[in-house]
């Protein structure tokens, strides 16, 4: 059942185009509910909070709002999400999503920003099946600068020991990197000197591992249609999902250059399972 491939080339195409806004609805010529993500450029000092605002032009009753960071390889890494009136914190609790009372604006904040938080961020809205539709906001850039030492009149300067610690950390990391590089060089030299020792070795993949067709082959993930990036992008194995009903349709989505991870297939039923009791099932009233 897991190997079935649904006839969803459109989904594949949307994702292949680097997750530019995709909409699988009546009018593919324009996205419904454009998202804005502001400010376009934000600079904060390390330790300060960095807050972007993601705004929906129109508000549906049921949707998922994801906050992403763009990785160096142009992949979207999900940081946190808002789903069915519930905030889903990410692995790093510093990334927080807050829905504002007007319902259409969301504050996406990094608490105590670090230097390595600098990068490109965006938000994306997913409107739910059967007409699954993905919209992404324009990108915004965050620059986290080193904290400048301020005169004592404004705030007490950090103890000098801190910069010493930082220096020690840099030296330590550099040493480790140099060591690793030397080790790799040594391995390469040994392999070059004794080629026969390595020639006989056979690398065999287990039956469960995806078969790679070549060095550039992209891993293939099979997702049930309607389950588009609802899960954290991590490599931890997941418990096997309950069998999806037979009428479930699948989209085979190829993510270029992404490491394959087992257990990535998620069923449409797990989409429901991941949610709190949805307004659909509850009484006449539900949270805003």
């Amino acid at each position: 059942m897991g190997s079935r491939r649904g006839p969803w080339p459109l989904v594949w195409a949307v994702l292949q185009l680097g997750w530019w806004p995709g909409w699988l609805l009546d009018s593919p010529d324009r996205p419904w509910s454009p998202l804005t993500f502001s400010p376009a450029q934000l600079t904060v000092q390390e330790g300060e909070n960095a807050t972007f605002t993601c705004s929906l032009a129109d508000i549906p009753d049921s949707f998922v709002l994801n906050w992403y960071r763009l990785s160096p390889r142009n992949q979207t890494d999900k940081l946190a999400a808002f789903q069915e009136d519930r905030i889903e914190p990410g692995r790093d609790r510093r990334f927080r999503v807050t829905r504002l009372p007007n319902g259409r604006d969301f504050h996406m904040s990094i608490v105590a920003a670090r230097l390595n938080d600098s990068g490109i961020y965006l938000c994306g809205a997913i409107y739910l099946p059967p007409n699954t539709q993905i919209n992404e906001s324009p990108r915004a850039e965050l620059s986290v600068t080193e904290r400048t030492l301020e005169p004592p009149t404004q705030s007490p300067s950090p103890p000098p020991r801190l910069s010493g610690q930082l220096q020690g950390l840099v030296i330590g990391v550099t040493s480790v990197l140099v060591g690793v590089l030397l080790l790799l060089l040594l391995t390469w030299v040994l392999a070059a000197v004794f080629p026969r020792a390595t020639r006989g070795a056979c690398v065999c993949g287990s039956e469960d591992e995806p078969l790679k067709e070549g060095p550039d082959a992209a891993p293939v993930f099979t997702l049930d249609y309607g389950e588009l990036d609802f899960q954290w992008r991590e490599k931890t194995p997941e418990p096997p999902a309950p069998c999806a009903p037979e009428q479930t349709e699948y989209a085979t989505i190829v993510f270029p250059g992404r490491p394959a991870s087992p257990g990535r297939r998620a069923s449409a039923s797990s989409l429901q399972g991941a949610q709190p009791p949805s307004p659909e099932d509850g009484p006449g009233l539900w949270p805003p």
Epitope: L25, D26, S27, W32, S33, D58, I59, P60, D61, S62, F63, P101, N102, G103, R104, Y127, L128, P129, P130, N131, Q133, S278, P279, E280, D281, G282, G284, L285, W286, P287, P288
Partner: antibody, heavy 120, light 112 residues
Framework: QVQLVESGGDLVKPGGSLRLSCVAS????????MTWVRQVPGMGLQWVAY????????SYADAVKGRFTISRDNAKNTLYLHMNSLRAEDTALYYC?????????????WGQGTLVTVSS | DIVMTQTPLSLSVSPGEPASISCKAS???????????LYWFRQKPGQSPQRLVY???YRDPGVPDRFSGSGSGTDFTLRISRVEADDAGVYYC?????????FGQGTKLEIK
């Protein structure tokens, strides 16, 4: 362009039946709770029924409970109102709409309405 | 059911003048979430209703900032700071805290 287009309104005798349809386009219909609201010409607005996104959760005004059934087909982007045992007081312009259910902040879209006349 | 009572039932205002419509609910519209679910709609002659304001104070997209909502608990007001000819129509308040959703009887705004 967001559109809600109602149809099915007609002249019907008391005790008769009708099925109203509302076809949605230009927005993700399946992500919106949908509502029927009616208006007696020259009078005020009266909420009739709503159905939530998945279609299994519904609610009705006391005046139509047991006679009207609201349903939706998300694959066809269509909302329905099945009306049985029609009475003269059901005569009204029937609108389908979004953003008219308890505690929603969802965007509000309205159709142009379809006229139901119950008369002998 | 929650009863919504609007005053006045009709209003005649000159262009550029302010206008104010009041809406009283038979019980509090404050939800346990801390939000108050009071809506304002306008119906222009021969047209479908259009929502202007939701959750007491939040204007829908495209609604001019001449329109403002206020109030809490059971008493609410829609104000138009400077009335324009295009504002003519019937204005309805509606409550969204409790099923069934109920509307006020409407206030007809006429431009002199």
């Amino acid at each position: 362009q967001v559109q809600l287009v109602e149809s099915g309104g007609d002249l019907v005798k008391p005790g008769g039946s009708l099925r109203l349809s509302c076809v949605a386009s230009g927005f993700p219909f399946s992500s919106f709770h949908m509502t029927w609201v009616r208006q007696v010409p020259g009078m005020g607005l009266q909420w009739v029924a709503y159905v939530k996104t998945g279609g299994s959760s519904t609610s009705y005004a006391d005046a139509v409970k047991g006679r009207f059934t609201i349903s939706r087909d998300n694959a066809k982007n269509t909302l329905y109102l099945h009306m049985n045992s029609l009475r003269a007081e059901d005569t009204a312009l029937y609108y389908c709409a979004t953003g008219v259910v308890p505690t929603t902040v969802a965007s509000s879209y309205w159709g142009q309405g379809t006229l139901v006349t119950v008369s002998s | 059911d929650i009863v919504m009572t609007q005053t006045p039932l009709s209003l005649s205002v000159s262009p550029g003048e302010p206008a104010s419509i009041s809406c009283k609910a038979s019980q509090s519209l404050l939800h346990s979430s801390g939000y108050t679910y009071l809506y304002w709609f306008r119906q222009k002659p021969g047209q479908s209703p259009q929502r202007l304001v939701y959750k007491v104070v939040y204007r829908d997209p495209g609604v001019p900032d001449r329109f403002s909502g206020s109030g809490s608990g059971t008493d609410f007001t829609l104000r138009i700071s400077r009335v324009e000819a295009d504002d003519a129509g019937v204005y309805y308040c509606g409550q969204g805290i409790k099923d069934p959703f109920t509307f006020g009887q409407g206030t007809k705004l006429e431009i002199k």
